[in-house]
C-alpha cells in the first residue's frame, strides 16, 4: 500500500475580516493510526491551531466528523477571521507513539490572506487659521487595511489636488497596514465654503471609496476691508460717519471708534449680514456733534478681527463754520447699526 500523503489542495485562501476561513486537508490513507494537528507557520516557533486529540479551540470547527473510523477529511473552519490570522497553515499527520505521538507527514501548506477594510479616513487641518494666498497642510490617515495595495486621492471642491505626499506603513510584510498623506492647499478668499476631501480606494470597498472631509471654514481667516464715509448732515450740528467692514471671516470682530485718538466707543459685531461666499459684512455708524469741536476732527475706525492686530481707517471731518452752540457737551452719539446686504 502507498505511503500516506497529506493533501492541502489550496495553495492560498483569501478571506474577508469577520468571515470564516475553510482550510482543506485530506489524507490518502488511514494508516498509520494517529491524530492530525494544524499549525500556523513551520519550524520550532510554529503555533498550534487545532489538535484532534486534545485541547480547547473555540474558533475552530472540523468540516467532517473526525471520530469516525474511516474519516480521511481533516479540513477545518476558523471563525471570525482578523488580519492577525494571516499566515501559512499546515495540516500535519502524527503517528501514534509512546509516550508521545511522532510527526509523520505534513501538507504543503495553505496561505491564508485576510482582506480588511481601511478605517474611515480622518482629515485634520492646521492648528491655527491662515489667510488667503497662504499654503496650509492637511493630513489624512486610515488604518487597519489588508492587503497593502491602496490608492489615496485629495480633492478641493471636487477638483483633484496634486501636491501631496503619501506613505503606507509598515514597508515590509504585515497583518495590516496604515496610510498617511499630507496635502498642501493654497487658500483663496472664496474658500469659506470650500471642502478638502481625502478619498481612499481599496479592494475591500468594492468600488465605493471611503471619504474624509475637512471644512476650510475651520482653517481660513479672511481679513476685513474697511471703508469710512461721511453721510449727509443729519441735523444742522450733527454728522453721520459710517464704517463699512466688508468680507471678513470668521465673525469674531470688535470695532472701536476714535476721535482725535481718543476712544469714543467700542462694540462687538453681532447682527452681521452674510455674503454668498460665506464672508460677513457689518456696518457701524457714529453721530458726531460738530458743535462740540473747535478744530477739524480725525475719526478712526479701528477693527480687531479674530484676535489679530488691529487694522484701522481714518476720516478727516472738516469743522469749517460752527453753528450756534446748543448747550450740548456730547461730542458723539453712541449708535450702532447693521446694514442690509447689498451684494
Amino acid at each position: 500500500e502507498e505511503e500516506l500523503q497529506v493533501i492541502q489542495p489550496d495553495k492560498s485562501v483569501l478571506v474577508a475580516a469577520g468571515e470564516t476561513a475553510t482550510l482543506r486537508c485530506t489524507a490518502t490513507s488511514l494508516i498509520p493510526v494517529g491524530p492530525i494537528q494544524w499549525f500556523r507557520g513551520a519550524g520550532p516557533g510554529r503555533e498550534l491551531i487545532y489538535n484532534q486529540k486534545e485541547g480547547h479551540f473555540p474558533r475552530v470547527t472540523t468540516v467532517s466528523d473526525l471520530t469516525k473510523r474511516n474519516n480521511m477529511d481533516f479540513s477545518i473552519r476558523i471563525g471570525n477571521i482578523t488580519p492577525a490570522d494571516a499566515g501559512t497553515y499546515y495540516c500535519v499527520k502524527f503517528r501514534k507513539g509512546s509516550p508521545d505521538d511522532v510527526e509523520f507527514k505534513s501538507g504543503a501548506g495553505t496561505e491564508l490572506s485576510v482582506r480588511a477594510k481601511p478605517s474611515a479616513p480622518v482629515v485634520s487641518g492646521p492648528a491655527a487659521r491662515a489667510t488667503p494666498q497662504h499654503t496650509v497642510s492637511f493630513t489624512c490617515e486610515s488604518h487597519g487595511f489588508s492587503p497593502r495595495d491602496i490608492t489615496l486621492k485629495w480633492f478641493k471642491n471636487g477638483n483633484e489636488l496634486s501636491d501631496f505626499q503619501t506613505n503606507v506603513d509598515p514597508v515590509g510584510e504585515s497583518v495590516s497596514y496604515s496610510i498617511h498623506s499630507t496635502a498642501k492647499v493654497v487658500l483663496t478668499r472664496e474658500d469659506v465654503h470650500s471642502q478638502v476631501i481625502c478619498e481612499v480606494a481599496h479592494v475591500t470597498l468594492q468600488g465605493d471609496p471611503l471619504r474624509g472631509t475637512a471644512n476650510l471654514s475651520e482653517t481660513i481667516r479672511v481679513p476685513p476691508t474697511l471703508e469710512v464715509t461721511q453721510q449727509p448732515v443729519r441735523a444742522e450740528n450733527q454728522v453721520n460717519v459710517t464704517c463699512q467692514v466688508r468680507k471678513f471671516y470668521p465673525q469674531r470682530l470688535q470695532l472701536t471708534w476714535l476721535e482725535n485718538g481718543n476712544v469714543s466707543r467700542t462694540e462687538t459685531a453681532s447682527t452681521v449680514t452674510e455674503n454668498k461666499d460665506g464672508t460677513y459684512n457689518w456696518m457701524s455708524w457714529l453721530l458726531v456733534n460738530v458743535s462740540a469741536h473747535r478744530d477739524d476732527v480725525k475719526l478712526t475706525c479701528q477693527v480687531e478681527h479674530d484676535g489679530q492686530p488691529a487694522v484701522s481707517k481714518s476720516h478727516d471731518l472738516k469743522v469749517s463754520a460752527h453753528p450756534k452752540e446748543q448747550g450740548s457737551n456730547t461730542a458723539a452719539e453712541n449708535t450702532g447699526s447693521n446694514e442690509r446686504n447689498i451684494y
Partner: antibody, heavy 121, light 107 residues
Framework: EVQMLESGGGLVQPGGSLRLSCAAS????????MSWVRQAPGKGLEWVSA????????HYADSVKGRFTISRDNSKNTLYLQMNSLRAEDTAVYYC??????????????WGQGTTVTVSS | EIVMTQSPATLSVSPGERATLSCRAS??????LAWYQQKSGQAPRLLIY???TRATGIPARFSGSGSGTEFTLTISSLQSEDFAGYYC?????????FGQGTKLEIK
Amino acid sequence: EVQMLESGGGLVQPGGSLRLSCAASGFTFSSYAMSWVRQAPGKGLEWVSAISGSGSSTHYADSVKGRFTISRDNSKNTLYLQMNSLRAEDTAVYYCAAYSGSYYYYGMDVWGQGTTVTVSS
Amino acid sequence: EIVMTQSPATLSVSPGERATLSCRASQSVSRNLAWYQQKSGQAPRLLIYGASTRATGIPARFSGSGSGTEFTLTISSLQSEDFAGYYCQQYNNWPYTFGQGTKLEIK
C-alpha cells in the same frame, strides 16, 4: 520626469511567445498598479491585464486568460507581459499604463508610447 | 463581462461648438467610469475619472456626467486640438472594459 518605455515587441509566428517589458522612471514604481492595454490596427482600445503595486494581485481579460502572464520587478522598476500561444488576433500596439496608486482605481493616468506585436506566419 | 457601448461612432462638429458623447454600460458601474482621449499615432490620455472628476491638467471645457449605466462626456467649446478619438472605460468589475470609441471630427 515620469516616463514609461515599452520594449520586446516584434514579429512572431502563431503559437509562438514574446515577452514585453515596460521600464518606468521618475516615480516610485512600487506605489502604482500597472496595466497593459492593446490596440489592434484601426481598432479601439482593449484592456488586457493589470497588476497591483505589490504584485500580489493580478487580473486578465477573458481573451488572454491562461495564455498571458503579467508580472513586475519592483527592484528594477519594470513591468512584464509574458505572451504564450500567440494568435493572429493578438496583433496590436501594446501600451503599458499606470494607475493613480497601488490599487487599480480612478483610471490610468500615465501611459507609455507602445510597442508593436505582429503575429503572422 | 460588462459591455460598454459608445454613441455615435463618429461625430462631426464645428470648432467652437459643443460636443456631446455618450457611453452606456450593460449593467450598473456606479460612478466608476473613466474617459480617455487618443490622438492619431499617440498614446491615450486620461480626461475624466469617477464619471465627472477632471484629471490633473485637463481644461475646464471637458466635463463628465452620469452614473449607473448612462454617461456623457461634454466638450463645451471645441478647440482644434480636441478632434480625436474618445473612449469610456468602466473600472467597477473585472475585467475592466472599454467602449468601442467615438471619433470626433471637424465638420
